[in-house]
């Protein structure tokens, strides 16, 4: 038996992907392990190979189908197992009954673009990726802007409590370089968490007009 504490955490992206991380203190580094997904009411099952992401944790993505296909519903329960090879046999290292729509983490928003920029403000839009039509408009967003001389961690969070795929940033400094990120979360799901942050969008405010009071 492998000693130490084990943690097996998975999230559904609401369409056709379940991402899992398995961490095990004292796990054997050279052991081949995989995640196996077995839905309770579907004809298919799926497997992915766990690959190391750190000393004692492994990750993999269960690709259930085409990226925008609705492969699971709110009624599905998926048995997820971590299986590791022991000689000629596979041993179950972790198991969970997974309710996909209680454990959501959407893909990071994409296609960030500057719609309009001025000296003190900037209008930015984005799109959500591979999000289920189930959510209708019941999504929320968090955004943050990186100012010169600060870190992302210091950036104040702006919360959008509805499905609004744009923001108008105000009180910016003229002729200044900024970066912007956004993330998304559905209201649904007891263990749902924020998506990863989007790729940063760099933009520069316009310089103040010469000889004018701005």
């Amino acid at each position: 038996a492998v000693n130490g504490t084990s943690q097996f955490t998975c999230f559904y992206n609401s369409r056709a992907n379940i991402s899992c991380v398995w961490s095990q203190d004292g796990a054997l580094q050279d052991t081949s392990c995989q995640v196996h997904a077995w839905p309770d009411r579907r004809r298919w099952n799926q497997t992915c190979e766990l690959l190391p992401v750190s000393q004692a944790s492994w990750a993999c993505n269960l690709i259930l189908g085409a990226p925008d296909s609705q492969k699971l519903t709110t009624v599905d329960i998926v048995t997820l197992r971590v299986l590791c090879r022991e000689g000629v046999r596979w041993r179950v290292m972790a198991i969970q009954d997974f309710k996909p729509f209680e454990n959501l983490r959407l893909m990071a928003p994409i296609s960030l673009q500057v719609v309009h920029v001025e000296t003190h403000r900037c209008n930015i839009s984005w799109e959500i990726s591979q999000a289920s039509h189930y959510f209708e408009r019941h999504l929320e967003f968090e955004a943050r802007t990186l100012s010169p001389g600060h870190t992302w961690e210091e950036a104040p969070l702006l919360t959008l409590k509805q499905k609004q795929e744009w923001i108008c940033l105000e009180t910016l400094t003229p002729d200044t370089q900024y970066e912007f990120q956004v993330r998304v979360k559905p209201l649904q799901g007891e263990f749902t968490t924020w998506s990863p942050w989007s790729q940063p969008l760099a933009f520069r405010t316009k310089p103040a007009a010469l000889g004018k009071d701005t």
Partner: antibody, heavy 117, light 107 residues
Framework: EVQLVQSGAEVKKPGATVKISCKVS????????MHWVQQAPGKGLEWMGW????????EYAPGFQDRVTITADTSTDTAYMELSSLRSEDTAVYYC??????????WGQGTTVTVSS | EIVMTQSPATLSVSPGERATLSCRAS??????LHWYQQKPGQAPRLLII???QSISGIPARFSGSRSGTEFTLTISSLQSEDFAVYFC?????????FGQGTKLEIK
């Protein structure tokens, strides 16, 4: 403006089948879930099931799954609910509704079905 | 199947006063609880989702809260148009089920 317009009242004999339509407008029917709910005088609101218009997948409540069929015609933006082997306790108002799987955001006006010999 | 129990069955309150309606689930349902209002001869209307999130267009006097498996709908200052039947509905386990309703009537 979101609208769900249901077909008119029906009177049926026990053992017969009823089919109710729900014509929608004001939203994209092709990526919607369409639900059906029964409201019978003594039984309150009961969720019968839904259809995902995106892929045609259906989900039926156990109490109805032997007798109910939900369909969707994406060419006319219309959902249908067919209930067979009618009995007197099926006398009720039937609602179509639009929503995610978890709650019902918009409702039709209701269709009264009376089952009587 | 999860049983939703609403209390009281009928609640008599004067206009301008506060109304508190209760809904209890027979098992843990997290925050998967939604509230509807139904007036005579009309379809239900969605008010609150996930226990406490107000729906766009619903007046601010409607609010929801949760304590374990007990959920509360509060109407802070009753208007004449608020007298109706209120239903709760769980979406934790299929089949999703409704409470039997609380009739809010004018005192």
């Amino acid at each position: 403006e979101v609208q769900l317009v249901q077909s008119g009242a029906e009177v049926k004999k026990p053992g017969a089948t009823v089919k109710i339509s729900c014509k929608v407008s004001g939203f994209n029917f092709k990526d919607s879930l369409m639900h059906w709910v029964q409201q019978a005088p003594g039984k309150g609101l009961e969720w019968m099931g839904w259809i995902d218009s995106e892929n045609g997948e259906t989900e039926y409540a156990p109490g109805f799954q032997d007798r109910v069929t939900i369909t969707a015609d994406t060419s006319t933006d219309t959902a249908y609910m067919e209930l067979s082997s009618l009995r007197s306790e099926d006398t009720a108002v039937y609602y179509c509704a639009r929503g995610g799987p978890w709650f019902l955001s918009y409702w039709g006006q209701g269709t009264t079905v009376t089952v009587s010999s | 199947e999860i049983v939703m129990t609403q209390s009281p069955a009928t609640l008599s309150v004067s206009p301008g006063e506060r109304a508190t309606l209760s809904c209890r689930a027979s098992q843990i349902i997290s925050n998967n609880l939604h509230w509807y209002q139904q007036k005579p001869g009309q379809a239900p209307r969605l008010l609150i989702i996930y226990g406490l999130q107000s729906i766009s267009g619903i007046p601010a006097r409607f609010s929801g809260s949760r304590s374990g498996t007990e959920f509360t709908l509060t109407i802070s200052s009753l208007q004449s148009e608020d007298f109706a039947v209120y239903f709760c509905q769980q979406s934790n386990n299929w089949p999703y089920t409704f409470g039997q309703g609380t009739k809010l009537e004018i005192k």
